[in-house]
Structures are given as C-alpha cells and as structure tokens.
Amino acid sequence: MRRGPRSLRGRDAPAPTPCVPAECFDLLVRACVACGLLRTPRPKPAGASSPAPRTALQPQE
C-alpha cells in the first residue's frame, strides 16, 4: 500500500506537519496533539503582553 500525503494545502499554506489527520500540530511544543488540546488563537488587544497563544496547523484531507 503506497502511503498518501499527510495533508493537502493551499499554495501559501505552511509546510506539511508530521501529524496524522486525526491530530493537530502544536506550534508551541512542536508536537502532534489531539486538536481539542489546542485553543484557537484570538487577536490580542494593542499593547497586550500576555504569552503567545498555542496555535495549530492541521491538514484538511
């Protein structure tokens, strides 16, 4: 069985992640995790200095 691509992305999308489609890539820890463990990043108010939110890259098959 030939292994298909992990992800299908737009031309300007980030490079493919090592995650299977069942998981998301956590940019903060640079690891694949369950997508529910990530939080969608929200825009920060101007001047806010809170730590950067966890973000994810996730393939759409």
């Epitope: 489609p21 369950a34 529910g36 990530l38 969608t40 996730q58």
Partner: antibody, heavy 118, light 113 residues
Framework: EVKLVESGGGLVQPGGSLRLSCAIS????????MSWVRQPPGKALEWLGF??????????EYNPSVKGRFTISRDNSQSIFYLQMNTLRAEDSATYYC?????????WGQGTTVTVSA | DIVMSQSPSSLAVSVGEKVTMSCKSS????????????LAWYQQKPGQSPKLLIY???TRESGVPDRFTGSGSGTDFTLTISSVKAEDLAVYYC?????????FGGGTKLEIK
C-alpha cells in the same frame, strides 16, 4: 492490503502480566500511529492508547484508566507492535484489538481474548 | 473525559427502511480553526472487529456504501442508513478523537425484523 493480526491472549491470574502482539503487514510500519482498544464481553469499546510514528519519535498517549499498568511499544524491524499489561485485574478481561490510526481508527485486527481469573 | 451517549440502545427495522441513530457528546467536538468535528462512526458485525464507516462526522470512508451518511456538529451527531440491508445487522459506535482519552459511545444495536 492492510493486515493486523493480534496474538498473545489467554488466561492469566489476577496480578499477573501478559504481552500482546500485533503483527502488521501491507503498509510502512514506521509511518503510522498504532493503537490498542479493548472490548469486555458484551460491552462497549474502550480506547487504551496509541504510539505515534517515527516522525513523532514514537511518543505515546494512554487512557488514564490503564496508564502506569499498560505500556505500548513497537519493534519496527519485525513489524510488530506490543501491549504490555501488568498487575492484571478481573475487569481487564476483554477482547483486545490493535488498530491503525490515521483519520480515526482506520483499520482493525481481528482481536485476541484475555481472561483474568483465579 | 468526554462522555459519548448513543440512542437508542437498540432498534429493529425492516429491510428497505430508513434508520437514524443519535450520538451526543458532553462537550463540543468542533475545532474551530478547521471546522472539523472529531467524531467517527464504526460498524461492528456479530463476531467481527469494528470497521470505520465515517470520520470527521460526515466523511465516508473509502468503500463504504453511500446509504451510510454522517451528519451533525458540535455535540449532536447522527448516523443515517437510507435503506437498510440485511447485511447492516450490527452494533454502531460513535467515538470522539477531539481529546484524550478517546472515548466511545455505548453503541446502537441494529436488528432486522
């Protein structure tokens, strides 16, 4: 064709240990996550955990219900994936399945039965 | 842990009838960044291992007949069999893979009248 064949089940006494095997064929072993799921007789399925692929350093995730007693590992040279079960209890009696993880639990083996009884 | 609740626990239908079964999760399975619901449906025929039917709540696995349709989002999901065949006799399980531990529903047993 993807093929998963479990073995190693049987009768074991409470407190004992058992190692289940899942022989893999039909795909590149190092390139897929592999999971274990169990099903007590007449009951629903319970996910036990999985081991990620080579690209992810073969890291593992476990169900807290078995973490510390069960260990998932793999021998890629022989295309075998293992479930080491320690300190077994009566409630661990079940059919144990291995499954390939990709979009969800994509392909399943036929299962091997474990009975924990004195 | 996310609790998955399926209903009904069993149902009996005649060949050719339409069947719907429900799966509810204790929290949303929708990941807003990609609009995917991390829910799968499996079919387990008597004496066999489970088989993946649907992933991402509504995407049919390759080779699965188009009479099987998954729908829903967030916490409420449905599996529909448009015209039941005798070979559809099985237990159907939903499963979330939104977070660890992955959890399954208790199953819906489909019997043929």
């Amino acid at each position: 064709e993807v093929k998963l064949v479990e073995s190693g089940g049987g009768l074991v006494q409470p407190g004992g240990s058992l190692r289940l095997s899942c022989a893999i064929s039909g795909f590149t072993v190092t390139a897929y996550y592999m999971s274990w799921v169990r099903q007590p007789p007449g009951k629903a399925l319970e996910w036990l955990g999985f081991i990620r692929d080579k690209a992810n350093g073969y890291t593992t995730e476990y169900n807290p219900s078995v973490k510390g007693r069960f260990t998932i590992s793999r021998d890629n040279s022989q295309s075998i994936f293992y479930l080491q079960m320690n300190t077994l209890r009566a409630e661990d009696s079940a059919t144990y399945y291995c499954a390939q993880v990709r979009r969800a639990l994509d392909y399943w083996g036929q299962g091997t039965t474990v009975t924990v009884s004195a | 842990d996310i609790v998955m609740s399926q209903s009904p626990s069993s149902l009996a239908v005649s060949v050719g009838e339409k069947v719907t079964m429900s799966c509810k999760s204790s929290q949303s399975l929708l990941y807003s960044s990609n609009q995917n619901n991390y829910l799968a449906w499996y079919q387990q025929k008597p004496g066999q291992s489970p088989k993946l039917l649907i992933y991402w709540a509504s995407t049919r696995e390759s080779g699965v007949p188009d009479r099987f349709t998954g729908s829903g989002s967030g916490t409420d999901f449905t599996l529909t069999i448009s015209s039941v065949k005798a070979e559809d006799l099985a237990v159907y399980y939903c499963q979330q893979y939104y977070t660890y531990p992955y959890t399954f529903g208790g199953g819906t047993k489909l019997e043929i009248k």
